[in-house]
């Protein structure tokens, strides 16, 4: 069965010149409703009736999920990180089998001293978080470990983390060149074999706000874009006001369609408005009667 939905209409003219009604429910197509229990189900675009109202999927809203939002929430992570897999060779400790056991007294002590040494090496790198030993093996002690870096998310986060990884490489190369054994003894906290220092792999957090924006905009992906305000990304359509890409509809209302943003121009008591941006006003003749 068909149901009639009461709507309030405003007389608007599209920029092409035809007068159309723009109610809170889009009535350009008939709304087919079906009885679900005692409720009418009339949710479009994948929305569902929760018993009281339509629950709409992004990027839709409205009584029947027929309108497209002007902005979509995207949430970049507060912090982004990088993990560097490194190997160094410690010569000031003789390897024993107990070092393989991460719960042993020997491993715990080695871990504490190594961490302390690396905290000294990397002091001055604001992104440095810490080190994590992944494996110890013979030769004297070959230390496979991760260096963890973290920074606040900004649009330039990749550059910040790339720079930090370069400084890590410089610092570990320097310390493993300088802190070496002399006469079979070490006078530093730890000594190293210069040739045993290797960077195996670097993994950086991947976050692309443009990609998230496009995914959430679905079939409107070509018309939503990312703009930054106070280093925070916003996923907006041109109908969202206050941004560089905002569309100015002057005497009209911006509406998203599958062909992009368009202006729906208003008709007042005295004027018709037209043009792509509803900025061309035509005064109504005095003898014209508006019904």
């Amino acid at each position: 069965p068909l149901a009639t939905i009461p709507v309030s209409t405003t007389s608007l003219t599209s920029s092409e010149g035809s007068t159309i009604s723009t109610p809170s429910v889009d009535i350009s197509t008939p709304v087919t409703t079906s009885i679900v229990g005692d409720q009418c189900s009339r949710c479009k675009n994948g929305g569902f009736w929760d018993g009281l109202k339509c629950q709409c999927l992004t990027p839709y809203y409205g009584e029947s999920c027929e309108e497209v939002v002007n902005s979509i929430d995207i949430a970049p992570p507060e912090t982004v990180s990088a993990q560097m897999e490194l190997t160094v060779t410690v010569t000031s400790v003789k390897f024993t089998d107990e070092l393989k056991n991460h719960s042993s007294q020997e491993f715990r002590e080695f871990n504490k001293t190594f961490t302390e040494q690396m905290n000294i090496v990397y002091s001055g790198i604001p992104e440095y978080v810490g080190v994590n030993i992944t494996n110890l093996r013979l030769g004297s002690v070959v230390v496979e470990h991760d260096v963890l870096l973290r920074t606040k998310y900004t649009p330039e986060y990749k550059t910040a983390l790339d720079n930090a990884t370069e400084v890590v490489k410089q610092k570990i190369t320097k310390v493993t060149t300088e802190q070496i054994m002399t006469n079979d003894n070490c006078s530093a906290l730890m000594c190293f074999n210069t040739t045993g220092t290797q960077v195996q792999n670097i993994t950086v957090t991947q976050y692309d706000p443009v990609e998230e924006c496009r995914q959430k905009a679905e079939e409107y992906e070509d018309y939503f874009l990312v703009e930054y305000r106070d280093q925070k990304p916003y996923c907006i359509s041109p109908c969202e006001s206050g941004f560089n890409a905002s569309k100015n509809c002057n005497h009209g209302k911006c509406q998203m369609s599958q062909n992009g943003a368009r202006c729906l121009c208003v008709t007042t008591e005295t004027h018709w408005y037209s043009g792509e941006d509803c900025n061309q006003g035509t005064q109504k003749s005095h003898h014209h009667h508006h019904h």
Partner: nanobody, 124 residues
Framework: DVQLVESGGGVVQPGGSLRLSCAAS????????MAWFRQAPGKEREVVAF????????YYADSVKGRFTISHDNSKNTLYLQMNSLRAEDTAVYYC?????????????????WGQGTMVTVSS
């Protein structure tokens, strides 16, 4: 955790001898490092000697070579320092240090466990 208790300090005349002892407890292995450090008034703490309890390594500072002997009794878990031909410049607080690792470092910061120290005074 590892506990270290030194004994044997005292006053001795130049050329005399003393034997320091350090009793260790809390080790889960019978293979570890022990050392003697000393600190004279107004000076930094410096290594005197260290030993690996498996017998694999001993080290002496140049200033004590030929005069001091470091040893370890595995059955008693005790470290010793036999000091002969003592000199005035040997006057210091002597500390026992230990590590569960087989260390080859003379930097005191690398040694995690310490005794309270025993005073050795060489004076006529």
């Amino acid at each position: 955790d590892v506990q270290l208790v030194e004994s044997g300090g005292g006053v001795v005349q130049p050329g005399g001898s003393l034997r320091l002892s350090c009793a260790a407890s809390g080790y889960t292995s019978n293979r570890y490092s022990m050392a003697w450090f000393r600190q004279a008034p107004g000076k930094e703490r410096e290594v005197v000697a260290f030993i690996w309890t498996d017998g694999g390594r001993t080290y002496y500072a140049d200033s004590v070579k030929g005069r001091f002997t470091i040893s370890h009794d595995n059955s008693k878990n005790t470290l010793y320092l036999q000091m002969n031909s003592l000199r005035a410049e040997d006057t210091a607080v002597y500390y026992c240090a230990a590590s569960s690792l087989l260390l080859q470092t003379i930097n005191p910061r690398a040694w995690p466990y310490w005794g309270q120290g025993t005073m050795v005074t060489v004076s006529s």
